[in-house]
Structures are given as structure tokens and as C-alpha cells.
Interface confidence: low
């Protein structure tokens, strides 16, 4: 999905009002310096691409974040403010339903959510210069 045509300001507002708080809740009990940020993004469409990937794609050691509160709110924001996004997610959602598992917060998931926090912060500062 190409995130170029999303309403970035509306997504930013959704992040600031609620998603950011859910991410902090998920990370409660971990130090802010515990994980190094190894994922970055260069502009807002790129940031949303990476946010979607880390939020909804299963990875080794962290099977699924998609049922977390921040993920459901992220999905809702993208569906509302990115034209055509919800249609592209139908197949992905059906696949998710088939492999729903017991929720376990692993260290790998905490690391992944830490990366997500960094991506969201970058999304909110699109004019920062990057090497």
C-alpha cells in the first residue's frame, strides 16, 4: 500500500491523543534506554510503511502485536485517513484470524514496540534532516 495520500495531520492527532499512550502502557516497566533504535524512516509515507510492517507483520520472537490496543487504534487510523487502505488489509486480517494465539509479551515484542515508538516520533517530525 502506498501511504502517500494519507491525511498525515489527522493520523498525527490520533497518535498524540491515544496511540502514544497505549504504546507507553505496553512498554511500562522498561527503561527508555533499554533498546537501541535500529529502524528509521525518511518521510511520512515511509514512516507509515515501517509502522505498518512492525505492527502487523509477525517476526521471529514476536508472533503478533496486531491484537494490542495500540495496534487496533493504528489500524483504525490508517483505515479512516488513508484512502483504500482498509481494502488492502482484508486478506491480511483473515490470515490473522486463522493464527490467533495466546498473548505473550516477550522481550522481542518489547524491543519491537520500542522501535515503533521511534518511528512514530519520526513521523511527527517530518522536516528533520537525515543523513
Amino acid at each position: 500500500y502506498d501511504f502517500t495520500n494519507c491525511d498525515f495531520e489527522k493520523i498525527k492527532a490520533a497518535y498524540l491523543s491515544t496511540i502514544s499512550k497505549d504504546l507507553i502502557t505496553y512498554m511500562s516497566g522498561t527503561k527508555s534506554t533499554e533498546f537501541n533504535n535500529t529502524v528509521s524512516c525518511s518521510n511520512r509515507p515511509h514512516c507509515l510503511t515501517e509502522i505498518q510492517s512492525l505492527t502487523f507483520n509477525p517476526t521471529a520472537g514476536c508472533a503478533s502485536l496486531a491484537k494490542e490496543m495500540f495496534a487496533m487504534k493504528t489500524k483504525a487510523a490508517l483505515a479512516i485517513w488513508c484512502p483504500g487502505y482498509s481494502e488492502t488489509q482484508i486478506n491480511a486480517t483473515q490470515a490473522m484470524k486463522k493464527r490467533r494465539k495466546r498473548k505473550v509479551t516477550t522481550n522481542k515484542c518489547l524491543e519491537q514496540v520500542s522501535q515503533l515508538q521511534g518511528l512514530w516520533r519520526r513521523f511527527n517530525r517530518p522536516l528533520l534532516k537525515q543523513q
Epitope: T4, V39, S42, P45, H46, L54, N57, T59
Partner: antibody
Framework: EVQLVESGGGLVQPGGSLRLSCSVS????????VNWVRQAPGKGLEWLGA???????NYHSALISRLTISKDNSKSTVYLQMNSLRAEDTAVYYC????????????WGQGTLVTVSS | EIVLTQSPGTLSLSPGERATLSCSAS???????LHWYQQKPGQAPRLLIY???NLASGVPDRFSGSGSGTDFTLTISRLEPEDFAVYYC?????????FGQGTKLEIK
């Protein structure tokens, strides 16, 4: 069919500059990024930088002062400008198309050889 | 900057044998950002495996990838003559990309 074709390589004097072109087909530069990667003779791959659909760029931190990546969407061409060339810049220069904004390079050009020598 | 170190530098095996190539990252990586390429002399690199374990289009299923954190592996279950080449691991989320130094797989 996605294709990338590099051109502009050749012999360059030390201290000189190069401007390479990457002509693309099968996709639009308005929406897709292109990366540059080089390979010195007998050596490994080195990422140089990227230009994205919206025109934003990223560069290898060690080369940022000597490197400029630009594009002309209407000509479906991406350019790599590199200044103050030295012998160690001798390499085959490739352009590559990433999958979306990822670092997954599924499509590569054939490469163009740049030799820096007096 | 994340540094990728590949081992061994050269691997000498015979057709039919199993090859195991390693890639170690200087700090922990999401498995979404680790990819493998094959390169033969005089050719551009070819994408083999993306996001740690997914086979690229047209790649035979004797190739597989695994790993997490800092340690990743490319395995070729049964070597064919055309598999002898240089293999590179690569990391990056599209910016600040780095490659390993490569592993040369040669015929014993």
C-alpha cells in the same frame, strides 16, 4: 517488466567528478524509490544512498559531503553525482529498486564501471 | 551504524553437500530487515531471501533462511553446481543500509 539501466561510467581523473544516470522502466519514479550501491574490484557491496518518490534522499554517512542523488520523473531517470573522486572510488556502480520503502532490492541494473586514475 | 559480519569468508564444499552461511549483526535487528543476495562473477546481485526467511521469486526451495536478534543463517540444503557464488547478507529499513563483507562458496 521492471528494468534499470546505468550509464555514464568511464575513466575519471582524481579530484574530478562523475555523474551517472539510471534509466528506469516498468515503474514510476513518482511513487518508487531508487538506491545506489557500488562494488570495488574484488570487494563487497557498499550502499551509497537512496532517493524516494517524494524526492527526499538518504546518504551513506561517510559520503554525504561528496554525494548528491537527484531525479527527473518525466525522463524516468535517477542521477548520482559524486565529487572529489579518489582511486578508492573505482567501482562498478549499480542502481537498484527497493520493494516499497524497504531495503529489499529485488531489481538491479547491470552496473557501470567507473575508474578513477590519472 | 549496524555492522554485519559474515562467516566463514570462504566455504569449500562439493555438489550435493549442505552449506550453512552465517551473518552476525553488531546489534539486535528486527527480522523484517535482514536479507540475502547471491552474486556471480560479472553479474549484479540477485535477491535470494528477504525478511530473514522468505524466498524471493524464482529461488529454489533448497535455499532457506533463519535467525533472529543478532544471528542469522542462510542454508542451502543440497548444493547444485550453479550455487557456487558469493553470498551477502544485508540489513536496512530502506535507509542506512549495510551489507556484510560476503561469503564465497567455492567448489571443493
Amino acid at each position: 517488466e521492471v528494468q534499470l539501466v546505468e550509464s555514464g561510467g568511464g575513466l575519471v581523473q582524481p579530484g574530478g567528478s562523475l555523474r551517472l544516470s539510471c534509466s528506469v522502466s516498468g515503474f514510476s519514479l513518482t511513487y518508487s524509490g531508487v538506491n545506489w550501491v557500488r562494488q570495488a574490484p574484488g570487494k563487497g557491496l557498499e550502499w551509497l544512498g537512496a532517493i524516494w518518490g517524494d524526492g527526499s534522499t538518504n546518504y551513506h554517512s561517510a559520503l554525504i559531503s561528496r554525494l548528491t542523488i537527484s531525479k527527473d520523473n518525466s525522463k524516468s531517470t535517477v542521477y548520482l553525482q559524486m565529487n572529489s573522486l579518489r582511486a578508492e572510488d573505482t567501482a562498478v556502480y549499480y542502481c537498484a529498486k527497493p520493494d516499497g520503502y524497504s531495503g529489499i532490492f529485488a531489481y538491479w541494473g547491470q552496473g557501470t564501471l567507473v575508474t578513477v586514475s590519472s | 551504524e549496524i555492522v554485519l559480519t559474515q562467516s566463514p569468508g570462504t566455504l569449500s564444499l562439493s555438489p550435493g553437500e549442505r552449506a550453512t552461511l552465517s551473518c552476525s549483526a553488531s546489534s539486535s535487528l528486527s527480522s523484517n530487515y535482514l536479507h540475502w543476495y547471491q552474486q556471480k562473477p560479472g553479474q549484479a546481485p540477485r535477491l535470494l531471501i528477504y525478511r530473514t526467511s522468505n524466498l524471493a521469486s524464482g529461488v529454489p526451495d533448497r535455499f532457506s533462511g533463519s535467525g533472529s536478534g543478532t544471528d542469522f543463517t542462510l542454508t542451502i540444503s543440497r548444493l547444485e553446481p550453479e550455487d557456487f557464488a558469493v553470498y551477502y547478507c544485508q540489513q536496512g529499513s530502506g535507509i542506512l543500509v549495510t551489507f556484510g563483507q560476503g561469503t564465497k562458496l567455492e567448489i571443493k
